[in-house]
Every structure is written in C-alpha cells, then in structure tokens.
C-alpha cells in the first residue's frame, strides 16, 4: 500500500531512508535538457523475495535534442547529485541496509538523472531526520517517521525534532558538537524497547539505535 503523503517537513531538517521497503517506487526523472528514453521505464521498483531485494527496471536518460539514439547508461557514482532524501552525513547509521530483509539499498545514480529523487513510499517505511548544516538538535538520539496505516488511511508519524539556529553560547574548545536528535519526550529508564505503540515501530533498523521518544509512560 503506497503512502498517500510525503514524510513530514521539519524546519531546518532533511530526511533520509536508510533502506527502502519492497514496493517502493522511484521516479525515473532526468535533469533539464534530458528525457527518458522512448519505451524507457517510468520508475524503478523495489522487489524481491524473502532472501533478496533489488530494484527492478533501469532508469535511462537521453538528450532531448537527440531523437534517434538510445544510449544504455550505467551508474556513475561520481555523478551523485544532492537529493531530498540522500546525502545525510549521519553518525547514527542504523544497520547496514543490505542486512534488512525485504528492503532495497539506495539505488545508484544514473547518467543525467534529475537533482532530486522522487520516491513513492509504502506503509512501514521509516525515514530518519537530521538537522541541516548550521542547525543543531535540542536532544540526542534518532528522529524518525514511519508511514502507518490507521483506520484505512495512511499517515506519517511526526518526528519530535527541533533544530535550533545560531548558538547564544560559544562552543568550548574540544567539545563535541551534537548531532541530529529528536525534540522528543523523555523515555523512562524502565521502559521496554520491545513495546510497539501506535506511534513507535521497532524494526531491526531501529533496534540498534537509542530509542528516545514515545515512551511507555504514554502507552
């Protein structure tokens, strides 16, 4: 089931999926001056079985000025562009995305692809947020959003992330700068990580991270 909306927008933050659930679609978009080849795929699709997941279809772009040539392209890693859901330098990589069953890795770039990737996420997808450069999070730990099905409708849970701007107090020399974290609700030390609530889904991905919001006090 596709999620109806995009993940929530958080001021001064970006999100990234560490892995993509089977059923996720990625539009084959080309940069200005280029177009999809005739009979080329409209999208890539994450598919797989219990042991392996991969992206079906290949995105291919050709010059808009070229009518007759259909050049088969191979991914050019050095041409990786800045995208809405990529390029996060997060110190909290959950687990190797390849080790998460039923999920695909970030697809490699294709030649002349658009600068922003447009994904169509499915229910159960989790994305992680981080403050953009120049902003810092008020709290420590991961901020995530999950696409959930509730009462027959899809919705994304709201990440509790606040990214603050210029500091009023200077950084002390040698003090480590804080990274992305949720403007969340304190987790009781006695709360149990295996508890699943309407607002928290435990996955293999999240299990390796400090869970710091939606505590048992509120379950």
């Amino acid at each position: 089931e596709l999620c109806d909306d995009d993940p929530p927008e958080i001021p001064h933050a970006t999100f990234k999926a560490m892995a993509y659930k089977e059923g996720t679609m990625l539009n084959c978009e080309c940069k200005r001056g280029f177009r999809r080849i005739k009979s080329g795929s409209l999208y890539m699709l994450c598919t797989g079985n219990s042991s392996h997941s991969s992206w079906d279809n290949q995105c291919q772009c050709t010059s808009s000025a070229t009518r007759n040539t259909t050049k088969q392209v191979t991914p050019q890693p050095e041409e990786q562009k800045e995208r809405k859901t990529t390029e996060m330098q997060s110190p909290m990589q959950p687990v190797d995305q390849a080790s998460l069953p039923g999920h695909c890795r970030e697809p490699p770039p294709w030649e002349n692809e658009a600068t922003e990737r447009i994904y169509h996420f499915v229910v159960g997808q989790m994305v992680y947020y981080q403050c953009v450069q120049g902003y810092r999070a008020l709290h420590r730990g991961p901020a995530e959003s999950v696409c959930k099905m509730t009462h027959g409708k899809t919705r994304w849970t709201q990440p509790q992330l606040i990214c603050t701007g210029e500091m009023e107090t200077s950084q002390f020399p040698g003090e480590e700068k804080p990274q992305a974290s949720p403007e969340g609700r304190p987790e009781s030390e006695t709360s149990c990580l295996v508890t699943t609530t309407d607002f928290q889904i435990q996955t293999e991905m999240a299990a390796t991270m400090e869970t710091s919001i939606f505590t048992t006090e509120y379950q």
């Epitope: 927008e9 958080i10 001021p11 001064h12 810092r136 999070a137 008020l138 709290h139 420590r140 730990g141 709201q158 509790q160 606040i162 603050t164 701007g165 500091m167 009023e168 107090t169 950084q171 002390f172 003090e175 480590e176 700068k177 804080p178 974290s181 403007e183 969340g184 609700r185 304190p186 987790e187 009781s188 030390e189 006695t190 400090e210 710091s212 505590t215």
Partner: antibody, heavy 114, light 111 residues
C-alpha cells in the same frame, strides 16, 4: 516514573540572587534538552530558558537575558537556574520541564519583594 | 503580550463541543513547527494534552483532539465534562526566539 523536583525558591529582595535546582529521575536526563518556564500569580506560562542535552548551547527569553544563567550537571541528573539582579516582575512559580516540554515539575515559588 | 494568541475564555455546557483557537506567525506555527496543548487544573502544574498538532498521550481521552492549519491551530473538546474546567495553553517552537512560545491561555468554564 518520570519525576522532576524543583527546589531553591523563596523570598528575596530586589537585586538579590537565587539558585533553583531541578532533580530529574526516571528518564535518560543526559539525552534531553531542558526548559525553565515560569508563571506569575494569576498569569499565563512564560518560557524562561532552554539548554541542550549536553549543555553546549543555551537560549533565554529577552526578559531574563543577561541576568539568568541555565546550566546542568548530567552526572547528577540536575538542572539549574542561577537568577541574579532579581526584580519584582520575576515573582512567579518556576517549573522545570523536559522534552516538548511535556514532563513538568510541580514548581517552586520565587517571590521578589522588599 | 503572548506570542501565540488564544481567546481568554471559553465556556460550554456538559456534553457540548468547545473549540479553542491558537494563532501564531511565520516564525512559529507558520514555519512548520508542531503545536502542543496543555491543560492546567487549578493549583497544579501544566499537563501535556496534545502533542505534535493532533497526537494524544495515552491516558488522555479521545474527546480531546487537535488540528493545525497554516499559522493557526485549534483544540476541540467534545462531550464536555465538569472536570474539563481548567486553563488551556497552546505552545510551539519559535525560531526567532530559539525557544518555545506559549499562548496566553484560555480559561474554560463548564456551565
């Protein structure tokens, strides 16, 4: 159970100083930014200050800037508010709060009067 | 003067539905920050009632609901009860202040 317990309030003369403390328990204190919020008698809530989880940055309401200092000791699970040059208009119940903020202490009354 | 604007009072009879509004600006609610609502019973500390615009902590009855649109938000209380008589505050982060801002509070009276 999450608990926040403020202390240090009392009667002080204008121009005087007080140091409030907030002892936290029941959650991972060192992972959360903490707030001080105050409420003057019969009035609404007014945010005073916030400190990041590691204490590396702090922000203040304009009304207290330069007079109040927020700090924390993560090894003691304690939040502080040093209040100097107190004025009559600082009279209020001072709450420490964690998170959204969603957990609040019961508050400590600060009265500034001659 | 509070940064977020709420009506100072609201009232209703038991069983009625009451709505409390909260209006902000482009530096807080309009900037995309979540709105939170607090209930403060007489003589007690504020208690989180709604967080992230429309989420309820467990233990809060589903008679309470929140919504947000543009630079404003609202709290709705349906099936009003006498124990709902309290002060209600909205709050949101404000990036120009680098801190949360509160509404002036709405005193709800159950007639």
């Amino acid at each position: 159970e999450v608990q926040l317990l403020e202390s240090g309030g009392g009667l002080v003369q204008p121009g005087g100083s007080l140091r409030l403390s907030c002892a936290a328990s029941g959650f991972t204190f060192s992972s959360y930014g903490m707030h001080w919020v105050r409420q003057a008698p019969g009035k609404g809530l007014e945010w005073v200050s916030v400190i990041s989880y590691d204490g590396s940055y702090k922000y203040y309401a304009d009304s207290v800037k330069g007079r109040f200092t927020i700090s924390r000791d993560n090894s003691k699970n304690t939040l502080y508010l040093q209040m100097n040059s107190l004025r009559a208009e600082d009279t209020a119940v001072y709450y420490c709060a964690a998170g959204v903020p969603d957990y609040w202490g019961q508050g400590t009354l600060v009265t500034v009067s001659s | 003067q509070s940064v977020l604007t709420q009506p100072p009072s609201a009232s209703g009879t038991p069983g009625q539905r009451v709505t409390i509004s909260c209006t902000g600006s482009s530096s807080n609610i309009g900037a995309g920050y979540d709105v939170h609502w607090y209930q403060q019973l007489p003589g007690t500390a504020p208690k989180l009632l709604i967080y992230s615009n429309n989420e309820r902590p467990s233990g809060v009855p589903d008679r309470f609901s929140g919504s947000k649109s543009g630079t404003s938000a609202s709290l709705a209380i349906s099936g009003l009860r006498s124990e709902d008589e309290a002060d209600y505050y909205c709050a949101a982060w404000d990036h120009s202040l680098n801190g949360p801002v509160f509404g002036g509070g709405t005193k709800l009276t159950v007639l």
